[in-house]
C-alpha cells in the first residue's frame, strides 16, 4: 500500500503518500476552528508509471498509452485512496462545538 | 456533472472528460483482442482549481492551500469519476467468447 | 458546423520565419486536436504535426528541429511557425481535424492558404 | 517511417464502370488507413477510414477492403464527379504518411 510505513521510509519518485501539514490560519486562512491549531494532512504526488499501483483497468490502459504518447498527457494521476476524519473544535458564540469533518486526512495513495 | 455534455460543447482548461480513442493493436500492443479494433476510452485532464468539482473535503482543503502555496506542487488532480465496461470479442483456440472489461471508459471526471 | 480556416502570408523570403493561424469554429480546442499537413503544387501530402487538447505537440522528425505548433484555447486559434524556410517549403498549408484524439484521420480540413518561397 | 506506395499514378475508365486503386503499406498498419478524394484546388475530403469504414456522408458506392499489406479503394458506377485525385493515408504510425496519389480521368 502506497501509505506512510512504505513512503515515509523510501525515496519514492513514484505516486506515493507525501507529508503535509497544514495550517488553518496560515494556510487556509479558516479563523473559525479553535483546535487543533493545523493538522497532518498529507497529499499524494508522484508519476503514475506502468502497473504502479493503478486503480482501475482504464488507468492501467492510460498508463500503457502514455509509454508511446506522453505529449498527450493522458495519463493517470496520483490521488488519495484511504482518508480519515479530522475532530476539531469551534464555537458558536461562547458555545464549544466538537465536530469530526470527515475525510480530512489522506492515509494511502494510488494511481487513477 | 464533469462529462461529454458538458466538456465536449465547452472550451474548458480546467478539469474536465476529454476524448481519447484507444486502438487495441496500434495503442497497447494487445492482439487478442477481435473485437472491436478499438474504442472510446476518454480521459480526464486540467486543472484543478479551487472549488471545481472537488471530491472531497481533503481535496478542498488541498486547493485552497495550493493557491497560497502553489510551488509545494500539492494540488489535487483531475481523474475519472464514473466508468463503464466494454464488451470485447475474443477467442480461445477456435471457440469465441464475449466478456466485459469492468471500469474501461470514462464518463466524468472529478478533482480528487 | 465545423469549421477551419488558415491565414498567412502568401509570399515568404528565403531563411525567413513563416507564421500561420488556424482559426476553428463548431468546435473546442480543449477536445480536439488540430494537425498541419502541406502539399507542395502538383505533389503529395506531408504531415507536419499536430497539438493535442492538452497542449501536447508531436512533430514530422524531418521538420521538428524547424516547426512549433501553440494554440490559444480561448480565440479558437491554432499557430504554426516554421523557420529557415527554402524554395522547397512552398506549398499550399493546410489545417486539419482529427474525428476522435488519436484516431489519427482527418475530417474536416482548412481550405488551405498557399505559401510561396522566393526572394 | 511507413511507406505508402500508391497505384497506379493515373487511371482512366468510362462512366458507369467500377475503378480500383491500391496503396501497399511497407509495414503492418493493422486496418489504419484513410482514403481521401481531392478535387483541383480544393482540401482533400475523407471517404474511408479503418480501411473499410465509410464516412458520414460519402456515396456508398465508395469502399474500401484490405488484403494483408495490400488495401484498395473500389469505386462502382463511376461517376463524372469521381474524376478527381485520391490519395490514401496511414493513420497507424508517426508520421502519419500518404500514398502518392492516384489521378482517375472519364474515357
Known amino acids: 500500500a502506497l501509505d506512510a510505513a512504505y513512503c515515509f521510509r523510501n525515496v519514492q519518485d513514484n505516486c506515493c503518500l507525501r507529508p503535509l501539514y497544514i495550517d488553518f490560519k496560515r494556510d487556509l486562512g479558516w479563523k473559525w476552528i479553535h483546535e487543533p491549531k493545523g493538522y497532518n494532512a498529507n497529499f499524494c504526488a508522484g508519476a503514475c508509471p506502468y502497473l504502479w499501483s493503478s486503480d482501475t483497468q482504464h488507468s492501467r490502459v492510460l498508463s500503457l498509452y502514455n509509454t508511446i504518447n506522453p505529449e498527450a498527457s493522458a495519463s493517470p494521476c496520483c490521488v488519495s485512496q484511504d482518508l480519515e476524519p479530522l475532530t476539531i473544535l469551534y464555537y458558536i458564540g461562547k458555545t464549544p462545538k466538537i465536530e469530526q469533518l470527515s475525510n480530512m486526512i489522506v492515509k494511502s495513495c494510488k494511481c487513477s | 456533472a464533469l462529462d461529454a455534455a458538458y466538456c465536449f460543447r465547452n472550451v474548458q482548461d480546467n478539469c474536465c472528460l476529454r476524448p481519447l480513442y484507444i486502438d487495441f493493436k496500434r495503442d497497447l500492443g494487445w492482439k487478442w483482442i477481435h473485437e472491436p479494433k478499438g474504442y472510446n476510452a476518454n480521459f480526464c485532464a486540467g486543472a484543478c482549481p479551487y472549488l471545481w468539482s472537488s471530491d472531497t473535503q481533503h481535496s478542498r482543503v488541498l486547493s485552497l492551500y495550493n493557491t497560497i502555496n502553489p510551488e509545494a506542487s500539492a494540488s489535487p488532480c483531475c481523474v475519472s469519476q464514473d466508468l463503464e465496461p466494454l464488451t470485447i470479442l475474443y477467442y480461445i483456440g477456435k471457440t469465441p467468447k464475449i466478456e466485459q472489461l469492468s471500469n474501461m471508459i470514462v464518463k466524468s471526471c472529478k478533482c480528487s | 458546423q465545423v469549421q477551419l480556416k488558415e491565414s498567412g502570408p502568401g509570399l515568404v523570403q528565403p531563411s525567413q520565419t513563416l507564421s500561420l493561424t488556424c482559426t476553428v469554429s463548431?468546435?473546442?480546442?480543449?477536445?480536439?486536436?488540430v494537425h498541419w499537413v502541406r502539399q507542395p503544387p502538383g505533389k503529395g501530402l506531408e504531415w507536419m504535426g499536430l497539438?493535442?487538447?492538452?497542449?501536447?505537440?508531436r512533430y514530422n522528425s524531418a521538420l521538428k528541429s524547424r516547426l512549433s505548433i501553440s494554440k490559444d484555447t480561448s480565440k479558437s486559434q491554432v499557430f504554426l511557425r516554421m523557420n529557415s524556410l527554402q524554395t522547397e517549403d512552398t506549398a499550399t498549408y493546410y489545417c486539419?481535424?482529427?474525428?476522435?484524439?488519436?484516431?489519427?484521420?482527418?475530417?474536416?480540413w482548412g481550405p488551405g492558404t498557399m505559401v510561396t518561397v522566393s526572394s | 517511417d511507413i511507406q505508402m506506395t500508391q497505384s497506379p499514378a493515373s487511371l482512366s475508365a468510362s462512366l458507369g464502370e467500377t475503378v480500383t486503386i491500391e496503396c501497399l503499406a511497407s509495414?503492418?498498419?493493422?486496418?489504419?488507413l484513410a482514403w481521401y478524394q481531392q478535387k483541383p484546388g480544393k482540401s482533400p475530403q475523407l471517404l474511408i477510414y479503418?480501411?473499410?469504414s465509410l464516412q458520414d456522408g460519402v456515396p456508398s458506392r465508395f469502399s474500401g477492403s484490405e488484403s494483408g499489406p495490400q488495401y484498395s479503394l473500389e469505386i462502382n458506377s463511376l461517376q463524372s464527379e469521381d474524376a478527381v485525385t485520391y490519395f490514401c493515408?496511414?493513420?497507424?504510425?508517426?508520421?502519419?504518411?500518404f500514398g502518392s496519389g492516384t489521378k482517375l480521368e472519364i474515357k
Open positions: 479503418d480501411a473499410r
Open positions: 463548431g468546435f473546442s480546442l480543449t477536445t480536439y486536436n
Open positions: 486539419a481535424r482529427d474525428p476522435v484524439p488519436n484516431k489519427w484521420h482527418f475530417d474536416f
Open positions: 497539438i493535442w487538447n492538452t497542449g501536447g505537440t
Open positions: 509495414e503492418d498498419i493493422y486496418s489504419n
Open positions: 493515408q496511414q493513420h497507424h504510425a508517426y508520421p502519419f504518411t
